[in-house]
């Protein structure tokens, strides 16, 4: 008694797929595979298959049902923090060759990495024109201010909304200040946060307000404090710089905007007699902490002149180092003071029309605004590699 195995039905390739090998007929143990065109994937039900091969069985049936070649779907694109995504090809179309466009929230954010245009590729990933599969980045625009500099020198003035949107109030032991960098870092003076270096959460960080005691502000909390390794507490103010990492990104708006870091070319806007602006809630002429955010425009002082001013007692020799810059009037009266520590001394970059931080309020004479003495500020441009390393590492 003998029996011959039934040939299997001729395999009809699914739409957008093809059969291989093509044979006149398929008998017992013959097999075929299905390959999909570029941009299509093998699906059984809605589950993807890496490959598909069917084998002809003795009873003349294939051992597996025919799959489908379904167009690749990249799925809904990820949300972009501080940005949005628009569908270019069609309403919600996310399949092969569909195009989407990411953009950042206007005015306050700018796109980094690429142009934001992504295409759904055959591998099922949204891919930029540069071949990146990661999201673009919406980076806060820095150095925007409602204020335009007039270049004149005048006394302590009340700040208006949006004048110093990078200004940060730091409470925790003493009153100090800082300046927002990006959307989750604060630049400040090491001496202002030294006591909290091992207890970052003790820092109460407030921004987006003009009034020191106002209940209306944006609260931020510290995740970590990074004090420059060259700073020695109670032994002068060299390397008086620190960074605070916030535990959440803050939302950027007209009242909360980061300050720019100085470009390589920044020194050309910080020469002797160039005007910088210091702001804070520190002591005023009346001897009390300011209720309203105040600012003062002050000129940069020749470094040798400043060094000489602090060479005589009670100041130890070498108090003013190359990591510092000085600002103020020889006649006195215009200065930063206690409570302003850690705040930014800012300058307008006339090429980019953005404000940048040139100095950090560090120290000065016992009597603020004293004639022949000057406010001393940490020279930020000397610390750009340090700042960039900390921010990129953490």
């Amino acid at each position: 008694y003998t029996s011959t195995a039934q040939p299997c039905p001729y395999p009809m390739a699914p739409p957008n797929g093809h059969v291989s090998p093509v044979q006149a007929k398929y008998i017992l143990k013959d097999s075929f595979s299905i390959f999909c065109e570029t941009g299509y994937e093998l699906l059984q039900g809605h589950l993807p298959l890496k490959s598909f091969t069917a084998v002809c069985q003795k009873d003349g049936s294939w051992d597996r049902p025919m799959p489908a070649c379904s167009i690749v779907d990249c799925g809904p694109p990820d949300d972009l923090p501080s940005g949005r995504v628009e569908y270019i090809t069609g309403p919600g179309v996310t399949t092969y060759k569909a195009v989407i466009q990411y953009s950042c929230e206007e005015t306050f954010y700018t796109m980094k990495v690429n142009d934001g245009k992504y295409v759904c590729e055959a591998d099922g990933f949204w891919t930029s024109s540069k071949g990146e599969k990661s999201l673009p980045v919406c980076e806060p625009v820095c150095g925007l201010s409602a204020r335009t500099t007039g270049g004149r020198i005048y006394g302590g003035q009340k700040a208006k909304p949006g004048d110093f949107p990078w200004q940060v109030l730091i409470l925790g032991g003493t009153t100090a200040a800082g300046a927002l960098l990006y959307d989750n870092w604060v630049l400040t003076a090491a001496h202002a946060v030294y006591e909290q270096k091992h207890d970052a959460s003790a820092l109460d960080i407030r921004m987006g307000t003009l009034k020191r005691l106002s209940p209306h502000y944006t609260q931020a909390w510290s995740e970590a404090v990074f004090i420059h390794e060259g700073y020695t507490h109670d032994a002068g103010f060299d390397n008086d710089i620190a960074l605070i990492k916030l535990n959440n990104k803050v939302v950027i708006n007209s009242n909360i905007t980061p300050i720019c870091l100085p470009r390589k070319e920044a020194e050309s806007f910080m020469r002797t007699d160039d005007i910088g602006t210091a702001s804070g809630w520190g002591l005023t002429q009346r001897g009390f902490l300011a209720r309203n955010l105040m600012y003062v425009d002050i000129p940069i002082v020749d470094h040798q002149k400043c060094t000489a001013a602090y060479e005589k007692p009670p100041y130890p020799r070498g108090s003013v180092t190359a990591n510092m810059l000085c600002a103020g009037l020889e006649s006195g009266g215009k200065d930063s003071c206690r409570g302003d520590s850690g705040g930014a001394l800012v300058f307008l970059d006339s090429e980019t029309e953005r404000w940048f931080v040139g100095g950090i309020v560090s120290w000065g004479s016992m009597n603020c605004g004293e004639a022949g003495q000057y406010g001393v500020y940490t020279k930020v441009i000397n610390y750009i590699p340090w700042i960039e390393n900390i921010i990129s590492d953490f």
């Epitope: 994937e41 699906l43 039900g45 809605h46 589950l47 993807p48 379904s70 779907d73 990249c74 799925g75 809904p76 949005r84 995504v85 628009e86 569908y87 270019i88 309403p91 919600g92 996310t94 466009q101 099922g124």
Partner: antibody, heavy 117, light 111 residues
């Protein structure tokens, strides 16, 4: 935040036509799709069609192809739906809804159409 | 056209209990990457409001007592614990293909 403001209630005679509007304001987008949805009292939602105000491209539910015309004025960010040859079957609430992703993200408050002789 | 069949048509649930609404599609509305079913809530005199997108993703601002699941052709919306303000009609919606379609709705009443 996007807001959609639809035109007020309409009263029309059978056989007439009516044109309702939907104005988008707030954080409007370059590429979005304005859809129109019909909802009869006590009944479900029926998709009529959409327009891309940026390109003027439209697509319809076949059922409404000869009933509805969709247009948009890009400069005023206003979309329009005209319904023709009105019958009592057209008496109901029509919503405009703005689609950014694959779902309807923002809705107008609805325009009530009453067809009566 | 894809037909979405919702059940039950109406549902009475006691305060604090679980409400489960089903939606069955006449064909698969899932790809290997995503599922194109969304759930809306509609209260009398108001437009629908998006609750859940892509089968299980909660829309921002929607309470966590709402959850969704399923893939292929069978989907569910769960509300637990049900609150008095959840009295509304709930619709499933597919954006897998045009014409977009909606389920017939499920009217939820709180006892």
């Amino acid at each position: 935040q996007v807001q959609l403001q639809q035109s007020g209630a309409e009263l029309a005679k059978p056989g007439a036509s009516v044109k309702m509007s939907c104005k988008a304001s707030g954080n409007t987008f370059t590429n979005y799709w304005m859809h129109w949805i019909k909802q009869r009292p006590g009944q479900g939602l029926e998709w009529v069609g959409y327009i891309n105000p940026n390109t003027g491209y439209t697509d319809f539910n076949q059922k409404f192809k000869d009933k509805a015309t969709l247009t948009a004025d890009k400069s005023s960010t206003t979309a329009y739906m005209q319904l023709i040859s009105l019958t009592s079957e057209d008496s109901t609430v029509y919503y405009c809804t703005l689609q950014l992703g694959r779902n309807f993200d923002y809705w107008g408050q609805g325009t009530t159409l009453t067809v009566s002789s | 056209d894809i037909v979405l069949t919702q059940s039950p048509a109406s549902l009475g649930v006691s305060l604090g209990q679980r409400a489960t609404i089903s939606c069955r599609a006449s064909q698969s509305v899932s790809s290997s990457r995503s599922t194109y079913i969304h759930w809306y809530q509609q209260k009398p005199g108001q437009p629908p409001k998006l609750l859940i997108k892509y089968s299980s993703n909660l829309e921002s601002g929607v309470p966590a007592r709402f959850s969704g699941g399923g893939s292929g052709t069978d989907f569910t919306l769960n509300i637990h614990p049900v609150e008095a303000e959840d009295t509304a009609t709930y619709y499933c919606h597919q954006s897998w293909e045009i014409p977009y379609t909606f389920g017939g709705g499920t009217k939820l009443e709180i006892r």
